[in-house]
């Protein structure tokens, strides 16, 4: 019987209320041995993956997703999930990011609500693929 994976946690640095144009970093944490962390948004099919996982403590690993310049479209609910072969974890609780008008700061281009202004750390297109040797590409993939 495989043990259940603990739920990940999510936090935001420096906080969850961010001035327009400022930066924010989402921090996802899970157990050691995590291969991939994924940052998701509510009601969206889009996501960001990273395999840049570091050890935060002897029993915990983490990944960081940074948005360099927050826009209105970044406001919303975020959550983490991780892949520890061969299983995915449950999702973390939601964390709500609020974006406030920056007082007297430089103007920043607005993004309409619902648009895809996501973390700047963009994974490669094959981030969804099996983590297998290069020869995997020689194996035909089919649905039937």
């Amino acid at each position: 019987q495989e043990e259940d994976l603990p739920r990940p946690s999510i936090s935001a640095e420096p906080g969850t209320v961010i001035p327009l144009g400022s930066h924010v970093t989402f921090v996802c944490r899970g157990p050691v041995g995590v291969q991939t962390f994924r940052l998701e948004r509510d009601s969206r099919s889009t996501y960001n993956d990273t395999e840049d996982v570091s050890q935060a403590s002897p029993s915990e690993s983490e990944a960081r997703f940074r948005i360099d310049s927050v826009r209105e479209g970044n406001a919303g609910l975020y959550r983490c999930i991780y892949y520890k072969p061969p299983k995915w974890s449950e999702q973390s609780d939601y964390l709500e990011l609020l974006v406030k008008e920056s007082s007297g700061g430089p103007d920043s281009p607005d993004t309409e609500p619902g648009s895809s202004a996501g973390p700047t750390q963009r994974p490669s297109d094959n981030s969804h693929n099996e983590h297998a040797p290069a020869s995997q590409g020689l194996k035909a993939e089919h649905l039937y």
Epitope: S43, S45, T46, Y47, G73, W88, G114, S115, S127, H142
Partner: antibody, heavy 113, light 110 residues
């Protein structure tokens, strides 16, 4: 896809999609349908350890589930409007579960008395 | 509710010509738009994702552009094999949607 065929109105049907060459756990596995002579209609998808999203019209009557190599679509209270070809499709390329880069051939479902 | 409107519903062009298909989203979806080609009796085939990125193995005669709410698929140097129905699909929202696909455009090659 398998499990299609003729079924009477009000019935229940389960379609199965089998993957070969990859593990469905690592992907967003979608179901899409197409009525005869009509356009494509997204039903929903499953990903990770059985997270699901459905189109508004499919909620409650359609259920997607999976194993490591198969994805099922259970359909209940079927009506003539559910007649069509049902496709399973793999999503996940380009960081969206809705970018569907691999499709099954489809299975025909006919609802008629 | 996010709706995709495709125009025209049908278009006919000669071999060697160019076809332009438009897809309009009822709200901004950034660059999260995909295009598919479907021939009779076959499943759809992914052509373009993220509005302008060519899917693996797809001819460079197919091109996508646009962002926000207005998107375009262009097929240049038309071939007989391009006769098919083309669909756009929003690839951002999976919650509170009726359908992720546009209504389709039939391309006839003369």
């Amino acid at each position: 896809e398998s499990g299609g065929g003729l079924i009477t109105p009000g019935g229940t049907l389960t379609l199965t999609c089998t993957a070969s060459g990859f593990t469905v756990t690592r992907y967003y596995m979608n179901w899409v349908r197409q009525a005869p002579g009509k356009g494509l209609e997204w039903i929903g998808y499953i990903y990770a350890s059985s997270k699901t999203y459905y189109a508004n019209w499919a909620k409650g009557r359609f259920t997607i589930s999976k194993t490591s190599t198969t994805v099922d679509l259970k359909m209940t209270s079927l009506t003539a409007e559910d007649t069509g070809t049902y496709f399973c499709a793999r999503g996940g390329v380009g960081n969206s579960g809705l970018n569907l880069d691999l499709w099954g051939p489809g299975t025909l479902v006919t609802i008629s008395s | 509710e996010l709706v995709l409107t495709q125009t025209p519903a049908s278009v006919s062009e000669p071999v060697g010509g160019t076809v332009t298909i438009k897809c309009q989203a009822s709200q901004s979806i950034g660059s999260w738009l995909a295009w598919y080609q479907q021939k009779p009796g076959q499943p759809p085939k992914l052509l373009i994702y993220q509005a302008s990125r060519l899917a693996s193995g797809v001819s460079s005669r197919f091109g996508g552009s646009g962002s926000g709410t207005e998107f375009t698929l262009t097929i240049s140097d038309l071939e007989c094999a391009d006769a098919a129905t083309y669909y756009c699909q929003q690839a951002e929202y999976s919650g509170d949607v009726e359908n992720t696909f546009g209504g389709g455009t039939e391309v006839v090659v003369k």
